[in-house]
Interface confidence: low
């Protein structure tokens, strides 16, 4: 699935503070980290709001809409289902058919003002800048642009060495200085970013079969 299917609301969800990623957690227990990004409940709400289906949006259509918005539905399948159940139980969505995560869903008009915010925002009062389209009825889900900004993130991750077939060269822009260390070392050394190393090592490339969809 890709971002092709028109569906998701044209606008991006209201801004919110990105959850701080705990890198250590992953290292330690090997448990997968929680994906960052807006709660899926927001994306679901907006996708449902953007739909013109009178009878509600089916789970399949919803996934298509989320994929069109760039959300990795395969990776986050269970999160989508949980989000749906949660939104129904909160009254943000009404289930028009079926039970559980299957069936069809509509926005509960009483609960949803133009900009439904199912999740609790972190302090810092990000206000929902212009409704992202909840009330909008895009003929096509348009691609919401988003800025390159802000690094309010944890320090940049040490970059894994790019494929062996590549020769890494000196940095083009300092912000991207990368740690050219093996993955493991790189993790712990994430902060000690090496200054542009100039010796490009050309590694004999191995042919990789292109991953085609």
């Amino acid at each position: 699935m890709s971002e092709t299917a028109p569906a998701a609301p044209a606008a991006a969800p209201p801004a919110e503070k990105a959850p701080v990623k705990k890198k250590a957690a992953k290292k330690a227990g090997g448990t997968p980290r929680k994906a960052s990004g807006p709660p899926v409940s927001e994306l679901i709400t907006k996708a449902v709001a953007a739909s013109k289906e009178r009878s509600g949006v089916s789970l399949a259509a919803l996934k298509k809409a989320l994929a069109a918005a760039g959300y990795d539905v395969e990776k986050n399948n269970s999160r989508i289902k949980l989000g749906l159940k949660s939104l129904v139980s909160k009254g943000t969505l009404v289930q028009t058919k079926g039970t559980g995560a299957s069936g069809s869903f509509k926005l509960n008009k009483k609960a949803a003002s133009g900009e439904a915010k199912p999740k609790v925002k972190k302090a810092g009062g990000t206000k929902p800048k212009k409704p992202v389209g909840a009330a909008k009825k895009p003929k096509k889900a348009a691609g919401g642009a988003t800025p390159k900004k802000s690094a309010k993130k944890t320090p940049k991750k040490a970059k894994k060495p790019a494929a062996a077939t590549v020769t890494k060269k000196v940095a083009k822009s300092p912000k991207k200085a990368k740690v050219a260390k093996p993955k493991k070392a790189a993790k712990s050394a994430a902060k000690a970013v090496k200054p542009k190393a100039a010796k490009p090592k050309v590694v004999k490339p191995k042919k990789a079969a292109p991953k085609k969809k």
Epitope: M1, A12, A35, P138, K140, T146
Partner: antibody, heavy 117, light 108 residues
Framework: QVQLQESGPGLVKPSETLSLTCAVS?????????WGWIRQPPGKGLEWIGS???????YYNPSLKSRVTISVDTSKNQFSLKLSSVTAADTAVYYC??????????WGQGTLVTVSS | SSELTQDPAVSVALGQTVRITCQGD??????ASWYQQKPGQAPVLVIY???NRPSGIPDRFSGSSSGNTASLTITGAQAEDEADYYC???????????FGGGTKLTVL
Amino acid sequence: QVQLQESGPGLVKPSETLSLTCAVSGYSISSGYYWGWIRQPPGKGLEWIGSIYHSGSTYYNPSLKSRVTISVDTSKNQFSLKLSSVTAADTAVYYCARGKWSKFDYWGQGTLVTVSS
Amino acid sequence: SSELTQDPAVSVALGQTVRITCQGDSLRSYYASWYQQKPGQAPVLVIYGKNNRPSGIPDRFSGSSSGNTASLTITGAQAEDEADYYCNSRDSSGNHVVFGGGTKLTVL
């Protein structure tokens, strides 16, 4: 074939407002999509400035938000960028593009705007 | 600074395979898009979504994603593939677009 064309002054004085317009042909802005502005300072990378949906909802790069205004004129099938209080750091090639979320599939050829007195 | 990190420069021998990577927390939830930019030209979308190529883009270009890393692979690099490559995606808040710093690909 969707085409976008930026237009506007190539030279702007410091502290003034940079104004650019993007004319869209081959696709009706009111049919959907986001319409965005991206810039690229000489020798540097791409920076998203902001985007607007045909309905008028806008999304801006937080680092530029206080100075940016993007508007759309569906009757003329064009959208515009205004960047106030410019400095030399705003010198860049400015691109307009059509987007679906963060995927920009059609771009204008870009217009160089130099900020200098 | 950018929320998406790319290697500044990478080289590949003509006809060989090269992989350009892009890292960022938001890539755990969102697919990256990849753009090719040649000197003096506007960027061109080469890969988007899970692994989709716009029409006109050669099938030697492919995309993949794992964890917080997205990759653009060029299998059998050609001289004309020499260019700057940028990844972009939504940021972690989901509300903004971010671009990686770009990777300059040199075909030897």
